[in-house]
């Protein structure tokens, strides 16, 4: 009873530094509480970008100071990361945990490579 997590291979952030992608999981059980975490992998280092726990049927709520927002629909989570800059280009992994009721299940996506290109500064006008 493995939990498979699917996410797009590549996403290009907008000129305003916003990237959105869908994280979909195949739930092996009837979970009522799900935790979704976005991780960034650079070299061998993995860091947490943001995380949210939600009750099935309810909205996904990230902390106020989070750079992530999202909505959930069934076994699908629509994630948006904002405030991205060129230096944030990298592999963003969607991790899904079925927290309640037991048993616990872990699912980790293969990652979405997000490319961020800083916009060219506007030329000065006379």
């Amino acid at each position: 009873k493995a939990m498979h997590v699917a996410q797009p291979a590549v996403v290009l952030a907008s000129s305003r530094g916003i990237a959105s992608f869908v994280c979909e999981y195949a739930s092996p059980g009837k979970a009522t509480e799900v935790r979704v975490t976005v991780l960034r992998q650079a070299d061998s280092q993995v860091t947490e970008v943001c995380a949210a726990t939600y009750m099935m049927g309810n909205e996904l709520t990230f902390l106020d100071d989070s750079i992530c927002t999202g909505t959930s629909s069934g076994n699908q989570v629509n994630l948006t990361i904002q405030g991205l800059r060129a230096m944030d280009t990298g592999l963003y992994i969607c991790k899904v945990e079925l927290m309640y009721p037991p048993p616990y299940y872990l699912g980790i996506g293969n990652g979405t490579q997000i490319y961020v290109i800083d916009p060219e500064p506007c030329p000065d006008s006379d």
Partner: antibody, heavy 118, light 106 residues
Framework: QVQLVESGGGVVQPGRSLRLSCAAS????????MHWVRQAPGKGLEWVAV????????FYADSVKGRFTISSDNSKNTLYLQMNSLRAEDTAVYYC???????????WGQGTLVTVSS | EIVLTQSPGTLSLSPGERATLSCRAS?????LAWYQQKPGQAPRLLIY???SRATGIPDRFSGSGSGTDFTLTISRLEPEDFAVYYC?????????FGQGTKVEIK
């Protein structure tokens, strides 16, 4: 650097209680699941319990369910294991371990020995 | 509960030789790790996700496999590699370990 230091082990009589502590440093404690794993003398590793993130979710091995309670204090970066109704078969070295972002137990404490004997 | 069975129980080899350790699961496993434990010490993570080396682990250690059959290979045994090795599944609760394989000096 990440550090986990267990304490609270010792010799205790069957039926009595003991509380283990695990002091964590070098990482954001509340962002990780924290586990207790034990190892009886000369035996293999046995997972005991886990507490998740904000402490709202806890899971236990069947062998300790109803007798052991895992808890944490995020303000003190400390993990606890309250062990009640101890039995001889609970004799083991108890390790705390961090559940890494990708799920495996990436850091372990040095362990604390609990001996249950009359 | 997923039961992990390691084989052999003991592996007697000389430094420089290749070690192949097996871990078989009672049902399909999504996430598998390998740990090394030396006497009087805590376990140390070697491999996670069946084949990814943990930080600071030498490249003589490699993991492979999927489903129910997994392998840890040590390409050339160094004196410090003689220890007990455990596999663990962490994709679902309860988290379970194999009984261990002891790699000893021949």
């Amino acid at each position: 650097q990440v550090q986990l230091v267990e304490s609270g082990g010792g010799v205790v009589q069957p039926g009595r209680s003991l509380r283990l502590s695990c002091a964590a440093s070098g990482f954001t404690f509340s962002s990780y699941g924290m586990h207790w794993v034990r190892q009886a003398p000369g035996k293999g590793l046995e997972w005991v319990a886990v507490i998740w993130y904000d402490g709202s979710n806890k899971f236990y091995a069947d062998s300790v369910k109803g007798r052991f309670t895992i808890s944490s204090d995020n303000s003190k970066n400390t993990l606890y294991l309250q062990m009640n109704s101890l039995r001889a078969e609970d004799t083991a070295v108890y390790y705390c371990a961090r559940g890494g972002h990708l799920g495996s137990f990436d850091y372990w404490g040095q362990g604390t020995l609990v001996t249950v004997s009359s | 509960e997923i039961v992990l069975t390691q084989s052999p129980g003991t592996l007697s080899l000389s430094p420089g030789e290749r070690a192949t350790l097996s871990c078989r699961a009672s049902q399909s496993v999504s996430y598998l790790a390998w740990y090394q434990q030396k006497p009087g010490q805590a376990p140390r993570l070697l491999i996670y996700g069946a084949s990814s080396r943990a930080t600071g682990i030498p490249d003589r250690f490699s993991g492979s496999g999927s489903g129910t059959d997994f392998t840890l290979t040590i390409s050339r045994l160094e004196p410090e590699d003689f220890a007990v090795y455990y596999c663990q599944q962490y994709g679902s609760s309860p988290w379970t370990f194999g009984q261990g394989t002891k790699v000893e000096i021949k």
